[in-house]
Amino acid sequence: FKVATPYSLYVCPEGQNVTLTCRLLGPVDKGHDVTFYKTWYRSSRGEVQTCSERRPIRNLTFQDLHLHHGGHQAANTSHDLAQRHGLESASDHHGNFSITMRNLTLLDSGLYCCLVVEIRHHHSEHRVHGAMELQVQTGKDAPSNCVVYPSSSQDSENITAA
């Protein structure tokens, strides 16, 4: 399977909410011995290997934000810790995988990475990631609502094994 990022850039005004999205593409094994670990973290521009650096999102690490489930099951993060930080990650039956960030501030600007790990019990794991940028803007030339920039077809299909 692969991960697609429908949008490479989200530009939002302060105070807005945004949902960053990744999508699983290709065949997904729904066997009993296969589970999926999905999570989000921040990274840095300039890395030769995109998403190689893992930084917390609003002080929550990728372990705090992870989802763990089988096949195309739906899942949400545990509400307490994440929601206290204005965050919620979710996964649906169609392979969509997202993180919602509420009440954006300038501090939220940065490069965000989704990570999906397919774990086969007693076997190796397969991991892929997608990257997108969030820019929170201020002042008179900030947009009134979030503006999204679609990934080029090459971007959205271009996934690097982590």
């Epitope: 995109t50 600007s109 030339d141 080029s152």
Partner: antibody, heavy 119, light 105 residues
């Protein structure tokens, strides 16, 4: 209109540090990535890194990581690039350049600052 | 890391001639841009996203290509076009080609 005005030429000794400034005007400073690109005499362009003034998020070329620091002062709409442990091969013109949102290209450039490293 | 290779390194032509500059990437890139630089000046954006003409740039300049191979074409050279041209890409990090010097024959 958008303007990027850089500080003047510097002469430094090997091992020293240099701090170059780039003052922005004509747009909302916090909303656009600012990059630093250098050019050694007779050579091509080399990307060093960038800073997002809204929250000081940075991204550096691995080649310069540990030696370069980019900062900003929102009160004066100025970004700074400090390069430490200078060597003779750091002699170059250093440019700041604004990245247009959503494009990944540089639409405005500073005039350049010549940094000479010589003993 | 994606490496951009420009060819030729130097191109000698006369005013009125057509110039074709190439930029090749070691792997597929999302965005390719072209800049012009004259001696003692900062670079100036010519073409963005492979084929779009930047503001104020004459229509004799054009860009094409996708994936790993890109071309900058100047249909009929004017005296002020003799300069160094750089291609530039972003795919998580930024790199420039080494430049093509366009000189008067």
């Amino acid at each position: 209109q958008v303007q990027l005005v850089q500080s003047g030429a510097e002469v430094k000794k090997p091992g020293a540090s240099v701090k170059v400034s780039c003052k922005a005007s004509g747009y909302t400073f916090a909303n656009f990535w600012m990059h630093w690109v250098r050019q050694a005499p007779g050579q091509g362009l080399e990307w060093m890194g960038a800073i997002f003034p809204g929250n000081s998020d940075t991204g550096y070329n691995q080649k310069f990581k540990g030696r370069v620091t980019m900062t900003r002062d929102t009160s004066t709409s100025t970004v700074y690039m400090e390069l430490s442990s200078l060597r003779s091969e750091d002699t170059a013109v250093y440019y700041c350049a604004r990245e247009l949102t959503g494009t990944y290209y540089f639409d405005y450039w500073g005039q350049g600052t010549l940094v000479t490293v010589s003993s | 890391e994606i490496v951009l290779t420009q060819s030729p390194a130097t191109l000698s032509l006369s005013p009125g001639e057509r110039a074709t500059l190439s930029c090749s990437a070691t792997s597929s890139v999302s965005y390719m841009h072209w800049y012009q630089q004259k001696p003692g000046q900062a670079p100036r954006l010519l073409i963005y996203s492979s084929s779009n003409l930047a503001s104020g740039i004459p229509a004799r300049f054009s860009g094409s290509g996708s994936g790993t191979d890109f071309t900058l074409t100047i249909s009929s050279l004017e005296p002020e076009d003799f300069a160094v041209y750089y291609c530039h890409q972003w795919s998580g990090h930024f790199t420039f080609g080494q430049g093509t010097k366009l000189e008067i024959k």
